[in-house]
Structures are given as structure tokens and as C-alpha cells.
């Protein structure tokens, strides 16, 4: 009986034509959100004045339907057990699931001028700028709409420059007809235990912005894990929004709508700095910030977004060191809504339900030459938004669940 | 891609003064800023000073500040080094360039003109 469980397992989560894997594979039957929460400042002129606390108040949910497109360009390779894809990019606006619209206001920290004066530490080239920032009538923090803090607004201190640069600027431009990857990933037919497990990204199997093994592209990406999986595993996979990887631990027992699943989360510990995890001293890139990496729950993926200074962390700086949140006033980190959680069907290795969560941040530092800046006397990471990215199996594909899969094991 | 040729240097006596022009052909000249280098025989190429594109504003070596000036004229696709009080030690080959900020930022310019010979002697 097992045996011939195990064997039409390993044949259904083969990612090939004809199998339950690929059908929900190439275009997930999951409906996923994703929740923004904006930080609004509420008191910049103090913060620009006098370097005080940032005071922050989230404002959310602001939720849009995501990863509903297809896979494209879905190839087979049979000389080395592969299949190759693109993950389209698309984001749908969800008033009924938001508490306003997109073309609410926000305080938030200026992008262009924070990156700007963070890429550009020549003394002749801060003058410059503070003269186009001053020209511009820009300053410190700024007043934008969800719109365009997400997707791209102009940015009229860098229109002012007279030869062509990117002059739109956004936390996630561009998105909308973009797409993530190529991912080449293991099929599985060959060794089942390899199934959906990265082979390369972008056509590397480094990522080329880390030291290491700290630079390596691990495991799968998340939708699904390798069958039969085990409470005692460590559950490697890559995040390109995050631009690394990182791993989820057993936690605890779930029930999900009549099937037992395995709750694991990202832990702590993978959020540690070098002193307590010796195994993250490649992902401390810079001794200042960091405090001679001593900081944790930050992560600095400058070199992932060419150069801006941006900052990951899990939402209200969740596992973060005390100096990371003091500048900043206003956030409440709690585990159960700020954690990263994966529900995974051990028998399939399916991953029926996952929270991810992450906080953008972005880094301004005092400059001498760039008057908007001049009075700050420290560092400041600044929250921009957080988001929760979520998906549960449906109770339609939860029942076909229960009736093939966990139903004939019990 | 701005192509650039300097003129103007020659022998001087300490304390005396020299203008240095720079002759830029390209369409690009007047959207970047633009600067003046000098390299000493046996030492590396140093910065000396620079100007945007406007002229607005204008940022020189502390070795030179006070007694050179920089200026251009994007009408005529100029740019000038006026040195007043020199020294011994500003001889060297004088080299102008520009380039968009990046280039600044990093001291990477993609190609050097010929240069113009400033000896400074008695």
C-alpha cells in the first residue's frame, strides 16, 4: 500500500506535462495577495531640523492580487531534467480588500535624494546635487501617492539633470509587464528529491552579490519542496526579492481545512548577526551601518539594486537589534503578524498556505554638502512599508486534496 | 562622446599666470560637467578643478584654491583654467575632460585628450 502511495507520488510531482504538480505549477489555482501597510511620517520638518526619532504610523492594508499570470516561456530539457521559465510580474488593485485608494497621500522619506546622496559621495558631486535638490524645491522626506511609491512617479530633482538618466523612480518600478528570472529548475524525473529545486537563475548559479556560500542560490522557490518531507529538515529556498537565500525550521502541526500540514518559519537565527551566527558573516557587506556587524535583522541589499541604499528586515524590525529601531518611533513588531510562515503538505511537498512578510527600508545619511541633510547627526534606516504576501489552497482544490492525496494515506 | 583638445600652456616664471583652454566637439558638451587634471613626470594624474554644467558652481584641489579659476562658455563649447601665483610645483601636463557624474564619482573618464605642457621655472 505505502509503496504504491509513494510511487504515484513520486510520479504526480514530476514537473512534466500531464501531472497535478505542473498543472498547479505553471499558473498557481491559489488566489495570492499582497498587503502593503506605508509608514506616514508624521514629523519630518523636526527629523530634517533637529535629527530627531522618525515617528512613523503604518496606514493599511492596501492589497492587490499578484502572481496570477502564467509561467512563460516553459521549456523541457530531457538531456539534463530541467525546465526553464519566466515568472511574469502583474499586480491588480483590490479596493474592497484595502482601506483606501491608490491615490492616497503619503510622508514618506524622498527615494531619489536618500539613494542620490548614498551613491554619490564625491564632495564636487554632492554640491551638484544639493543644487538640483534645492532647484527642485525637493527635501528630505516628500508627499506621494500609493501609486506612486509602488509603481513610479518622475522625480523632478533628477529631471533636472541634463543628459539622460532614469528619472522615474519606485519601490517596485518597474513591475507591471516585467518578469522574474529565467529560473531553470530541476523537473524531478530523474531524482525525485530534486524536484523544483533551482539548477540556475538568470542563467548563474551564484547570485555574484554576496561572499561565499552566502552568494549561493538554494533549494526551491517555496511554492514547493522535494515530497515527503520531514519535521527534522531545514527547507532551503531563494527569495529574489529579497535577494538571497534563506531557510524555514519545523515549527508546528496544522490543520488546513482537513489536511495536516507542517508549519515552518523563518527563524530568528537567520536573521542574527555573525556574533550570534557565525554562518551570516557573508551577508554583514559594510562595518559602519552594521557597527562592525554587530547590528541583526537587517539586511543591506545595496548591491542587488544598483547601489540604492536598501535595507531588508521582517515588518516593524521583527529580530532586529534595539539601535536598528531606535531612531524610529511608532512600530510594534509581534511575531504572529510579522513572521514568515510556509503550511507545506509533507506527502507532496506542496506548499498549501505561506505568509511572507518583509519591510523595505531605505538609508539617509547626514551630508555636509546636501543642505536637506546637513542637520542630521546620524544614520537612520528608514521604514518605507511593509508587506504580507499571502496564499491558501481553496476549498475546492483542498477537497480533491483530501480525497487523492492525504485521504488514501489515512 | 566629446572629444577634447587643450591648448594654452608654455613656461612661465614663478608667481606668473597662465590661461588654459579646452575646445569640446560633441553635442553632448554643455550637459556635463567638465574639469581640469594635471599629471607631474613620475606621478600619478590628480584632480585640479571642475565645473558644472551651468558654471553655477565650481570645486577645486585645495592646492590650487584661491589662485586658479575655472570657467566655460557652452556657446562656444569652452572651457578655461585661469592660473594666477604659480609655482614650481603646478608644473605638469594639464589635461581637461568631462563626463557624466557617475565618471566623477568613480575617476573613471573613458578617453584623454593630448594635454598642454605648463613648466613653472626661474
Known amino acids: 500500500g505505502d509503496l504504491l502511495i509513494q510511487k504515484t507520488i513520486k510520479k504526480q510531482v514530476v514537473l512534466e506535462e500531464g501531472t497535478i504538480a505542473f498543472k498547479n505549477w505553471v499558473k498557481t489555482g491559489t488566489e495570492v495577495y499582497r498587503q502593503f501597510w506605508i509608514f506616514d511620517v508624521q514629523n519630518p520638518q523636526e527629523v530634517m531640523m533637529n535629527s530627531s526619532n522618525i515617528q512613523v504610523k503604518q496606514r493599511g492594508p492596501y492589497t492587490y492580487r499578484v502572481r496570477f499570470l502564467a509561467k512563460e516561456n516553459v521549456t523541457q530539457d530531457a538531456e539534463d531534467n530541467t525546465v526553464s521559465f519566466l515568472q511574469p510580474n502583474g499586480a491588480i488593485f483590490e479596493p474592497s480588500l484595502s482601506v483606501g485608494t491608490e491615490a492616497d497621500n503619503f510622508t514618506v522619506l524622498n527615494l531619489a535624494v536618500a539613494a542620490a546622496s548614498h551613491i554619490y559621495q564625491n564632495q564636487f558631486v554632492q554640491m551638484i546635487l544639493n543644487s538640483l535638490i534645492n532647484k527642485s524645491k525637493s527635501s528630505m522626506f516628500q508627499v506621494r501617492t500609493l501609486r506612486e511609491l509602488l509603481w513610479g512617479y518622475r522625480d523632478p530633482f533628477l529631471s533636472l539633470v541634463p543628459y539622460p538618466v532614469t528619472t522615474t523612480v519606485g519601490l517596485f518600478y518597474p513591475y507591471n509587464n516585467t518578469a522574474d528570472g529565467v529560473y531553470k529548475v530541476f523537473n524531478g524525473k530523474d531524482n525525485i528529491s530534486k524536484v523544483a529545486i533551482i539548477d540556475t537563475y538568470k542563467g548563474k548559479r551564484n547570485l555574484s552579490y554576496w561572499e561565499s556560500h552566502c552568494d549561493m542560490i538554494n533549494g526551491t522557490d517555496a511554492a514547493s519542496f522535494p515530497p515527503f518531507v520531514e519535521k527534522s529538515q531545514v527547507l532551503q529556498f531563494f527569495s529574489s526579492d529579497i535577494c538571497r537565500s534563506i531557510y524555514a525550521v519545523f515549527e508546528s502541526d496544522v490543520n488546513l481545512k482537513g489536511i495536516p500540514v507542517y508549519r515552518f518559519v523563518l527563524p530568528s537565527k537567520a536573521f542574527a548577526s555573525p556574533v550570534e551566527n557565525p554562518d551570516n558573516y557573508c551577508f554583514c557587506t559594510e562595518k559602519i551601518i552594521s557597527k562592525n556587524c554587530t547590528s541583526y535583522g537587517v539586511l543591506d541589499i545595496s548591491k542587488c539594486k544598483e547601489g540604492r541604499p536598501v535595507y531588508i528586515s521582517l515588518p516593524h524590525f521583527l529580530y532586529a537589534s534595539p539601535d536598528v529601531s531606535e531612531p524610529i518611533d511608532g512600530l510594534n513588531p509581534n511575531e504572529e503578524e510579522h513572521r514568515t510562515y510556509l503550511d507545506i503538505e509533507p506527502i507532496t511537498g506542496f506548499t498549501l498556505q505561506f505568509a511572507k512578510r518583509l519591510q523595505v527600508n531605505l538609508l539617509v545619511k547626514p551630508s555636509e554638502k546636501i543642505q536637506v541633510l546637513k542637520n542630521l547627526k546620524r544614520n537612520y534606516i528608514v521604514p518605507i512599508l511593509w508587506l504580507n504576501e499571502t496564499g491558501t489552497i481553496g476549498d475546492e482544490k483542498a477537497n480533491m486534496f483530501r480525497s487523492q492525496v492525504t485521504g488514501k494515506i489515512n | 562622446q566629446v572629444q577634447l583638445q587643450e591648448s594654452g600652456g608654455g613656461l612661465v616664471q614663478p608667481g606668473g599666470s597662465l590661461r588654459l583652454s579646452c575646445a569640446a566637439s560633441g553635442r553632448t558638451f554643455s550637459s556635463y560637467p567638465m574639469g581640469w587634471f594635471r599629471q607631474a613626470p613620475g606621478k600619478e594624474r590628480e584632480f585640479v578643478a571642475a565645473i558644472d554644467w551651468s558654471g553655477d558652481i565650481t570645486y577645486y584641489a585645495d592646492s590650487v584654491k584661491g589662485r586658479f579659476a575655472i570657467s566655460r562658455d557652452n556657446a562656444k563649447n569652452m572651457v578655461y583654467l585661469q592660473m594666477n601665483s604659480l609655482k614650481p610645483e603646478d608644473t605638469a601636463v594639464y589635461y581637461c575632460?568631462?563626463?557624466?557624474?557617475?565618471?566623477?564619482?568613480?575617476?573613471?573618464?573613458?578617453?584623454w585628450g593630448q594635454g598642454t605642457q605648463v613648466t613653472v621655472s626661474s
Open positions: 575632460n568631462a563626463g557624466p557624474l557617475d565618471s566623477w564619482e568613480r575617476n573613471d573618464f573613458p578617453s
